[in-house]
Amino acid sequence: SIPWNLERITPPRYRADEYQPPDGGSLVEVYLLDTSIQSDHREIEGRVMVTDFENVPEEDGTRFHRQASKCDSHGTHLAGVVSGRDAGVAKGASMRSLRVLNCQGKGTVSGTLIGLEFIRKSQLVQPVGPLVVLLPLAGGYSRVLNAACQRLARAGVVLVTAAGNFRDDACLYSPASAPEVITVGATNAQDQPVTLGTLGTNFGRCVDLFAPGEDIIGASSDCSTCFVSQSGTSQAAAHVAGIAAMMLSAEPELTLAELRQRLIHFSAKDVINEAWFPEDQRVLTPNLVAALPPSTHGAGWQLFCRTVWSAHSGPTRMATAVARCAPDEELLSCSSFSRSGKRRGERMEAQGGKLVCRAHNAFGGEGVYAIARCCLLPQANCSVHTAPPAEASMGTRVHCHQQGHVLTGCSSHWEVEDLGTHKPPVLRPRGQPNQCVGHREASIHASCCHAPGLECKVKEHGIPAPQEQVTVACEEGWTLTGCSALPGTSHVLGAYAVDNTCVVRSRDVSTTGSTSEGAVTAVAICCRSRHLAQASQELQ
């Protein structure tokens, strides 16, 4: 029967008596930076070309015995997970291996850097089809390694890395913390985060998604027909590298941004038990388990968006946090979140010719997060319209006044520390959905975009009694671009998007009276692109 991990990533329509999805990634080359590998293992023979690249440190310990099968163990298994004949994800993908880890699985930053440079030069000398680079390794945070990953990603290479097995914040490790890299955590057959001894999978905002990473059957270097079960975020990353190879083989023109958005979009949502993660990391960690698209074609019509969390601002009074989208993505909205509820909102601002989302901490606050909603919107022309604090008691409002521009997100930020503490909620005037409304003491920012066929609508969900969480979701066929809370509720901790749902979080209800002050309204802006839908129909 099909191994659990392959079944998990396979959409039901492919689940015959064996795993045989269409096109096994044959147009894609996957580079593996790992240990040496047994390339003539029956599972991978002819699929893996061992390059002459080797840059590894000496093994530790005077009594270390270099046993070939042990030296090859990690890399052979991963090559099998990516492209193995019987237990692989992308059975048609060809691979090239570079040895950057020694027989004890240890490597150096310099060795990995030189390996990445080797790939870059190979690509320049002999350009092939799409390239995926699998980095099933993790070390301490390294600015220089992250920068090298960024350079390679900007040259059009897809990098996939392990989140790390330290049961820790992946942002503390490299290359996991590099924003341009697709960082993968590990889950088990029960869709729970993988525990490895006293440790386990890393987590946090630097993880893009999770994938099967426990008891993964793959090629064993003990013999040419042997299989073995291994666990870890390396195995999880290998699954995503295989899925990426399949997607790129079906659509070779996909950019890194498009691929990442598709990986997120087609993942299984909300299946991971978040209680495993530290409480402060739960909201930051994506609840996504990777899966192949149900069809490798025809996803182009979709408006894809993802949520990007900033690093924590820190607690100082004027501290700010910035969330950025990838170069090919549009920032369609910006929100903020603070566990203490003490924040001064957020704003979209230009930085280096690109919009970023900046959140502001407040006096006495423990810090804030900025949350960017990053979307793929071809031919988009987006701008931010700002209204300064209003004098009128009705509050501040701003709308998209340019012809053909639609509202994709609302933000507000204020200078006073205790905005809203004694203010009644401001109600949105009916029949004016294309505008943002806020407190009169707040600056209001509207994200207004023009793109072919783009249409958006506002959806609200209000709860009169206090609730720790209020949500509102976009319907099928619409994509959440903006998420905010209607102003006037002092206990709101912030708003953020989870997949296609807008979540507004409030302070513990036990500390809040059930006056009108307790009313919470979540506001979602849902968009779709008729242009993308028509384009995909023409392609088919």
Partner: antibody, heavy 115, light 109 residues
Amino acid sequence: QVQLVQSGAEVKKSGASVKVSCKASGYTLTSYGISWVRQAPGQGLEWMGWISVYNGNTNYAQKVQGRVTMTTDTSTSTVYMEVRSLRSDDTAVYYCARGYGMDVWGQGTTVTVSS
Amino acid sequence: QSALTQPASVSGSPGQSITISCTGTSSDVGGYNSVSWYQQHPGKPPKLMIYEVSNRPSGVSNRFSGSKSANTASLTISGLQADDEADYFCSSYTSTSMVFGGGTKLTVL
């Protein structure tokens, strides 16, 4: 192009040994092992075993285990198979083939065992 | 006694289609994606026609196709030609080795 070139025909007495060679060229040798297959006159194909050019590891079919030894000489890109204690039912054409996938075959070496 | 069972012979007229079956168990054909088919003309080495159940090596005519259902693999040759007359062998992985079928003699009438 990818080629496997085998040594010439052999005639051996019962109880003797024979060593057949197979020289590989035209591809990255370490990416594939070499399989050995034999075919008795008028009969089907029988897989005898496999050897890794990468590390010399072997995987023999149970039927011939103990009587067959496969070796490699990486300096000449040549793989050898020796069959000991030959019997008349070892009379066959012996083929080497690339890897377990056996996508490329040698021309065959006829081994005749006379009593 | 071969591990995989094939019909001893099949025949067909030029232009027709024929199918050769190869039956094993869940420990070989049913358990792996690695079923291959070989063509062998008299006095020649076998030639790989299909690998990994249904894939054709470059240079092999698209008249040859392979499939698998449970423990049985099949080779189909459409638009039979005189040159297709040969012996055909299937093979499969087992947990530690390889097994062949007994072979099927294809006669083009």
